[in-house]
Interface confidence: low
């Protein structure tokens, strides 16, 4: 299927202009290749009318142009002074006309309606409100005011000042007569329906002295906005329906093959299971506008989406809607990354998160998708180092490997960690991605002691056992803090042939703290990695206590039971998208978690990867 995308159908009226926008994947080849607009003839050939190389056919001379926007991956064809002869089938495309990189566009130019002289034209979107103005002369001020709809040769009474209301307009129409001295009455019709379209007649008085005014009401279905997003990326639908529906339930639905509209998500708590873990409906602003974010875009997400407002939380005739046509480009710039990552209870996961490589300085975030009601995504960690309190010691966001990917490590896994997580930045919102963490049966590969109590001034050794399959990996210990995990200096890792042969004696990496100080208290991670790609980790908490004459006691790390203040990816989406520079804080509430102490440094801490015998015969 061609990745070029545009409007399937374009309609206009004689004498008017149209602007046709076509989208293409903005690869360097596509950005610089020829763009064209051609008309399909009976023979099947497509005759160029205008191209990006400056060609304009004689038929289009002086009334058409093609503008390329390579940075956006779009080009626009403007055609003015339309005539009925312009109706037909066209293609917008890249390269040569006969190649497949094109999109079919149907253009219909119709004759403008013949309206009686002095007709006022009202053009309003479906579901909106229109106010029809009806002037009258002083002598008709005390007489009956009415609005009729012309149907064929007859006129049907819609409303009058004697309190008649046509049943088709019940509960959505009112006639207003102003105070004395104002010679105009108005008819307000709310929640316009497509069937309201037509010619109306205002009348004041009767007989030969009556005042009449024609009004042509054009009720338009919303023109779908074309949205072109990359596979695996993210799309945001901003829905602004107006203050009049600010307190009405909102929804996003997708038009199906039967041309009905299936609810994707609504504010009443309904959500399509196909979007589980990858959709948020962000709370509405005071003006009633709201947005829906969908991540992890799939080809099957393509289609026409409508947002709207109705007390039932689904599409109903006569209520305002907005429309989008979503195209998902398979030639995606967003790299493939695992959508499901599996870990075992007690073990760890390392999640790779893509971001736009042009935005290496952007702030990185990781949040936990929560499905309750409209969905929300409380931030768990960010690249500035803030971590939610209940994740202290087991969550870290690393800038590595860089160049379009960052890493999030979560260890000490429990079944409660299963769920959907989002990777995002304060930069390009289209690069938001979703990953599902699943907790499966099994044992962690790395084994560390469950709890360690160190004595001030003495030496501490912490062993970390790893299996043969990690023998070729780089092993490390690091001290966890809010701002990351500071790798501790490593000693020589022993004879290399032991690792090649996976000698039984080579399956231990130990951390030595000598002498232990107060600053050494905190979380330590043992981990494996290959270059800048991180593998499994295991965490151990070191408590530091005074030297005792007899016995010792493990001091458990303090854990706050109270839920911390949360930063939540909901209303903050707008700030992310506005790319706030001065203060890229996304959310109103902030919790700065204090550092758990200085980084262990210098020669006091060392990592030794050697035989278990040398470490005092710890179990393997």
């Amino acid at each position: 299927k061609s990745p070029v995308f545009g409007p399937q159908e374009v309609s206009s009226v004689e004498g008017n202009s149209v602007s046709i926008k076509c989208y293409y994947p903005p690869t360097s080849v596509n950005r610089h290749t020829r763009k064209y607009w051609c008309r399909k003839g009976a023979s099947g050939r497509c005759i160029t009318l205008v191209s990006s190389e400056g060609y304009v056919s004689s038929n289009y001379a002086g009334r058409a142009n093609l503008t390329n926007f390579p940075e956006n991956g779009t080009f626009v064809v403007n055609i003015a002074q339309l005539s009925r002869d312009d109706s037909g089938h066209y293609k917008c495309g890249l390269g040569i006309n006969s190649r497949g990189l094109s999109f079919d566009v149907s253009l219909e130019v119709s004759q403008g309606p013949e309206l009686p002289n002095g007709t006022e034209v009202y053009t309003v979107d479906v579901g909106r409100t229109v106010t029809i103005k009806c002037p009258f002369k002083t002598e008709n001020a005390p007489k009956t005011k009415a609005l009729y709809k012309k149907i064929g040769q007859t006129s049907v009474l819609v409303i009058d000042s004697r309190n008649y209301v046509n049943p088709n307009y019940k509960d959505r129409i009112r006639l207003r007569i102003p105070g004395t001295g104002q010679l105009i009455f108005t008819v307000v019709i709310d929640r316009l329906r497509l069937s309201d379209h037509g010619l109306y007649l205002c009348q004041a008085g009767d007989g030969s002295n009556r005042d009449e005014k024609n009004a042509d009401l054009q009720v338009l279905e919303p023109e779908p906005e074309l949205v072109y997003e990359d596979l695996r990326g993210s799309v945001t639908f901003h829905c602004a329906l107006g203050l009049e529906v600010a307190n009405v339930a909102k929804f996003l639905c997708r038009v199906n093959s039967r041309e009905t509209c299936d609810v994707v998500i609504n504010t009443l708590g309904k959500r399509d299971s196909a979007f589980e873990g990858r959709i948020l409906l962000n709370p509405q602003d005071k003006d009633g506008s709201f947005s829906v974010v969908i991540t992890g875009l799939r080809k099957e997400d393509e289609g026409r989406y409508l947002c709207g407002a109705h007390s039932d939380g689904q599409l109903q005739e006569g209520w305002p809607i907005q429309a989008w046509q979503l195209f998902v480009n398979e030639e995606s710039t967003i790299p493939r990354s695992p959508t499901v990552v599996k870990g075992v209870a007690g073990g760890s996961v390392a999640v790779l998160c893509p971001y736009n490589p042009k935005e290496s300085q952007s702030l990185k975030y990781w949040c936990l998708w929560e499905g309750a009601q409209n969905g929300r995504c409380p931030l768990l960690v960010e690249s500035q180092g803030l971590v939610q309190e209940q994740y202290e010691g087991r969550l870290s966001l690393l800038q590595e490997p860089g160049n379009g990917t960052f890493t999030v490590i979560l260890n000490q896994l429990t079944t409660q960690d299963a769920g959907f997580y989002w990777c995002l930045t304060n930069g390009d919102t289209r690069w938001r991605t979703t990953v599902e963490i699943k907790i499966i049966e099994g044992e962690p590969n790395l084994k560390v002691p469950g709890n360690v109590t160190a004595v001030l001034g003495e030496t501490l050794n912490i062993p970390c056992h790893f299996p043969c399959k990690f023998s070729s990996y780089e092993k490390y210990w690091c001290k966890w803090s809010n701002t990351g995990c500071q790798t501790l200096p490593s000693q020589d890792e022993g004879p290399s042939e032991a690792f090649v042969n996976c000698d039984e004696n080579s399956r231990l990496v130990s951390l030595t703290l000598n002498p232990v100080t107060r600053a050494d208290e905190g979380w330590y991670w043992c981990g494996v990695k290959q270059g800048h790609f991180y593998g499994e980790t295991a965490a151990v908490y070191v408590a530091v206590e005074e030297k005792k004459v007899a016995g010792s006691r493990y001091v458990s790390p303090a854990k706050a039971d109270a839920a911390p203040d949360e930063k939540v990816l909901d209303s903050g989406v707008r700030e992310i998208e506005n790319k706030a520079i001065q203060d890229p804080r996304l959310f109103a509430e902030e919790k700065v978690v204090a550092d758990t102490g200085d980084q262990a440094g210098g020669s006091r801490a060392s990592v030794d990867s050697s035989s278990s015998e040398e470490q005092g015969g710890s179990s393997k």
């Epitope: 159908e9 149907s106 038009v255 009905t260």
Partner: nanobody
Framework: EVQLVESGGGLVQAGGSLRLSCAAS????????MGWFRQAPGKEREFVAA????????YYADFVKGQFTISRDNAKNTVDLEMNRLKPEDTAVYYC????????????????WGQGTQVTVSS
């Protein structure tokens, strides 16, 4: 206002063909999609096929499966339904409707209807 008049119905043997036509008159609008629906005795009116104003988008009900073809001629303001390999279960009154709404498969979004034309398929 749009007036719609269907024609072309009648009695036909199973396996035969019919071509229904719908003529639109009055104050027509270029943005109307046209649809065919049918209603068998004692059943609800069901969607058969629809065609966008430009003819660029065509929709068929699942049961059609290549049996029917919808087309339109905007110059003549007509929409036709070519019905082949007719079966007794295709017996119904066939209605032509017009809508400016994108949800062409749903009868409640149609603004105007014709009076219907009877199609009877005998076995």
């Amino acid at each position: 206002e749009v007036q719609l008049v269907e024609s072309g119905g009648g009695l036909v043997q199973a396996g035969g063909s019919l071509r229904l036509s719908c003529a639109a008159s009055g104050r027509t609008f270029s943005r109307y999609a046209m649809g065919w629906f049918r209603q068998a005795p004692g059943k609800e009116r069901e969607f058969v096929a629809a065609i966008a104003w430009s003819g660029g988008a065509i929709y068929y009900a699942d049961f059609v499966k290549g049996q029917f073809t919808i087309s339109r001629d905007n110059a003549k303001n007509t929409v036709d339904l070519e019905m082949n390999r007719l079966k007794p279960e295709d017996t119904a009154v066939y209605y032509c409707g017009s809508t400016r709404d994108p949800r062409v498969g749903d009868k409640k979004f149609y603004d105007y209807w014709g009076q219907g034309t009877q199609v009877t398929v005998s076995s």
